[in-house]
């Protein structure tokens, strides 16, 4: 015998209290698949979270973060403070990248400058706190007496935007 609940579409639930008829999900709840016996409570985007997509009867709300913060975790389960380019977030707040490392985003960690010689290349543009080096041709490709290193381009906001 076919389960009568299997006929209940997304946006409804199979109501045991009413002879298993399909009832619409109550306000602030949803069911994203058919045949559900309950509707799920909608996520609420509060505090540092803001609503990216409203809850509907068939899909949950989606949150992102207020300006100055960025999402972490699946489905933006957390918001983390932005830092400036050239910094990383530590337990004590935003700290400048150490020499030889950079961060060209408002999130994430300071990473070591690329080691151009790993690929047999030279450094074309020096790194800064806000920018990685730019690797250039291999030293053998450079004409004798030619300088291989260009000073770094001036750092500018917004640089790599937070994702």
């Amino acid at each position: 015998l076919q389960d009568p609940c299997s006929n209940c579409p997304a946006g409804t639930f199979c109501d045991n209290n009413r002879n298993q008829i399909c009832s619409p999900c109550p306000p602030n709840s949803f069911s994203s698949a058919g045949g559900q016996r309950t509707c799920d409570i909608c996520r609420q985007c509060k505090g540092v979270f803001r609503t990216r997509k409203e809850c509907s009867s068939t899909s949950n709300a989606e949150c992102d973060c207020t300006p100055g913060f960025h999402c972490l975790g699946a489905g933006c389960s957390m918001c983390e403070q932005d830092c400036k380019q050239g910094q990383e977030l530590t337990k004590k707040g935003c700290k400048d990248c150490c020499f030889g490392t950079f961060n060209d985003q408002k999130r994430g960690i300071c990473r070591p400058w690329t080691n151009c010689s790993l690929d047999g290349k030279s450094v074309l543009v020096n790194g800064t706190k806000e920018r990685d080096v730019v690797c250039g041709p291999s030293p053998a490709d450079l004409s004798p007496g030619a300088s291989s290193v260009t000073p770094p381009a001036p750092a500018r906001e917004p640089g790599h935007s937070p994702q």
């Epitope: 790993l118 381009a153 935007s161």
Partner: antibody
């Protein structure tokens, strides 16, 4: 030499998912960013996102945030892009690329993987 | 997102001609501008990076120049094997963005 070899063409039904792979060789996989770029039929190139295989740090184009999941397996030097809830608009050639020695340019490109979404 | 406006969208030129393609960024991207060649078989190759640096092995007829928002890609003497579509791309700010492409044909 540096090479990126992608998985073969895929035909999928709307609503399905697909996982495209990109096997890297000829360099230290963990030291360079892998990018994914989409090209719809007759269209230009669109950057979807990238991953730094050393720590699996990812960046996404907001447009692909709910569509694509980029991962990397260091043990096999392979990067992946999984596309979910496929629609006809996702029909495209997907390329993986490797950076030139900092994230700002893409020096090596895979041969491309054609994903066709059709009922 | 940074918009990259590339022109022309297509052009037809004769072997030996000097060909110029321009790319304009919607905001300052310093020198983080790259040029790619996509052959009819869909293979893609980086030709020029950081505005004007040719990758090793790229013929000297290919060059690039510019800074800030306005950039130029030049083929000094067009060869039959240069039939391709050429794209500019900014690497300054995420998300990376490409120009619409210039399809180059031989007269």
């Amino acid at each position: 030499q540096v090479q990126l070899v992608q998985s073969g063409a895929e035909v999928k039904k709307p609503g399905a998912s697909v996982k495209v792979s990109c096997k890297a060789s000829g360099y230290t996989f963990t030291s360079y960013w892998i990018n994914w770029v989409r090209q719809a039929p007759g269209q230009g190139l669109e950057w979807a996102g990238n991953i730094y295989p050393s720590d699996s740090y990812t960046n996404y184009n907001q447009k692909f945030k709910d569509k694509a999941t980029i991962t990397a397996d260091k043990s096999t030097s392979t990067a992946y892009m999984e596309l979910s809830s496929l629609r006809s608009e996702d029909t495209a050639v997907y390329y993986c690329t490797r950076d030139y020695g900092s994230a700002y340019s893409m020096s090596t490109w895979g041969q491309g993987t054609t994903v066709t979404v059709s009922s | 997102d940074i918009q990259m406006t590339q022109s022309p969208s297509s052009l037809s030129a004769s072997v030996g001609d000097r060909v110029t393609i321009t790319c304009q960024a919607s905001q300052d991207i310093s020198n983080y501008l790259n040029w790619y060649q996509q052959k009819p078989d869909k293979t893609v190759k980086l030709l020029i990076y950081y505005t004007g640096r040719a990758r090793s092995g790229v013929p000297s007829r290919f060059s690039g120049s510019g800074s800030g928002t306005d950039f130029t890609f030049t083929i000094s003497s067009l060869q039959p094997e240069d039939i391709a579509t050429y794209f500019c791309q900014q690497g300054d700010t995420l998300p990376y963005t490409f120009g619409q492409g210039t399809k180059l044909e031989i007269k």
